[in-house]
């Protein structure tokens, strides 16, 4: 069993290394920013990310592209729920520094939990998305 887990971990590690999780990150950021825009947030505030959604994208146009590519990437983990969880954790960790305040972090986490389901995939049963202040080791 230990041997199997070790092989599984290695397989998951290589799967994660070949996955492009950026479209998932962009898709989720678009979602929470769209929600904020509808509550009066300035949609023209500058961003550090060259591929962050433009105000036009945030109104829905272009967002389906990030979602489609994101779902394709997550689909690669469908047979390995633990690895799917690792992918979600990686997305959370990669974006944690860009989330402003507890509210945005909770919102991002909520959307992230729903992501597999949105893609028509099984969501991992137990998946801790808390990011420790020191940051989780990314392999």
């Amino acid at each position: 069993r230990q041997q199997w887990e070790l092989q599984g971990d290695r397989r998951c590690q290589s799967q994660l290394e070949r996955a492009n999780l950026r479209p998932c990150e962009q898709h989720l950021m678009q979602k929470i920013q769209r929600d904020e825009d509808s509550y009066g947030r300035d949609p023209y505030s500058p961003s550090q990310d060259p591929y962050s959604p433009s105000p036009y994208d945030r109104r829905g146009a272009g967002s389906s592209q990030h979602q489609e590519r994101c779902c394709n990437e997550l689909n690669e983990f469908e047979n390995n729920q633990r690895c799917m969880c690792e992918a979600l954790q990686q997305i959370m960790e990669n974006q944690s520094d860009r989330l402003q305040g507890r509210q945005q972090e909770q919102q991002f986490k909520r959307e992230l939990r729903n992501l597999p389901q949105q893609c028509g995939l099984r969501a991992p049963q137990r998946c801790d998305l808390e990011v420790e202040s020191g940051g989780r080791d990314r392999y």
Epitope: R22, D57, H66, R69, E76
Partner: antibody, heavy 122, light 108 residues
Framework: QQLKESGGGLVKPGGSLKLCCKA?????????MNWVRQAPGKGLEWIGS????????YYADSVKGRFTLSRDNAQSTVCLQLNSLTAADTATYFC????????????????WGPGTLVTVSS | YVMMTQTPSSVSEAVGGTVTIYCRAS???????LVWYQQKPGQPPKLLIY???TRATGVPSRFRGSGSGTQFTLTISGMKAEDVATYYC?????????FGGGTEVVVK
């Protein structure tokens, strides 16, 4: 890092053909693969893509239901089965490796095969 | 289905001149999914620019990609004879991953 298509040739309308693309010099199972065709003197037409573990396969509307994409990671090969061929399918068929920028995320086709010519004529 | 329209279909420019190629998408395309390729006669396409503005490895700085939303541009500043080719834009965010019709660049 190389790709090489094979299987092209002359085929009659309504006929079938199987094109394959053999990869070398890189870990094939790490990459999504795509097929693009180009009719003589015309532009590029994307015809299909297959993800690393074959879990997601897409086709252009013009070939849907007639062409089938498959891959064998152990053999580092991606194949395209062409059925119900018409003169409109006459083209050079390219396979292309899809990669992405690890830091920022954009996808692109960075390695292409030289292409294989398919001629559909009676 | 995102349709990509390139203009002009052909352009003639003197060596040293500037060539501007436009690519219009029928709906908004994220910069992340906009790519430019160069194809010379008898050869497969070659990656030029990805992410709308990032030059691929080994691509000279005279090639510049810009734009966002539905309007994208490829500019060749200080055209060289070796730049004679057909240039294609492609969106690869939504399947089908469509190419523009191509722009043939020739030397005047």
């Amino acid at each position: 890092q190389q790709l090489k298509e094979s299987g092209g040739g002359l085929v009659k309308p309504g006929g079938s053909l199987k094109l394959c693309c053999k990869a070398s010099g890189f870990t094939f199972s790490d990459y999504n693969m795509n097929w693009v065709r180009q009719a003589p003197g015309k532009g590029l037409e994307w015809i299909g893509s297959i993800t690393r573990s074959s879990r997601t396969i897409y086709y252009a509307d013009s070939v849907k239901g007639r062409f089938t994409l498959s891959r064998d990671n152990a053999q580092s090969t991606v194949c395209l089965q062409l059925n119900s061929l018409t003169a409109a399918d006459t083209a050079t068929y390219f396979c292309a490796r899809e990669d992405f920028n690890v830091y920022t995320g954009p996808y692109y086709y960075d390695v292409w095969g030289p292409g294989t010519l398919v001629t559909v004529s009676s | 289905y995102v349709m990509m329209t390139q203009t002009p279909s052909s352009v003639s420019e003197a060596v040293g001149g500037t060539v501007t190629i436009y690519c219009r998408a029928s709906q908004s395309v994220s910069n992340m999914f906009l790519v430019w390729y160069q194809q010379k006669p008898g050869q497969p396409p070659k990656l030029l620019i990805y992410g709308a503005s990032t030059r691929a490895t080994g691509v000279p700085s005279r090639f510049r990609g810009s734009g966002s939303g539905t309007q994208f541009t490829l500019t060749i500043s200080g055209m060289k004879a070796e730049d004679v080719a057909t240039y294609y834009c492609q969106q690869n965010g939504n399947s089908p991953y469509t190419f523009g019709g191509g722009t043939e660049v020739v030397v005047k």
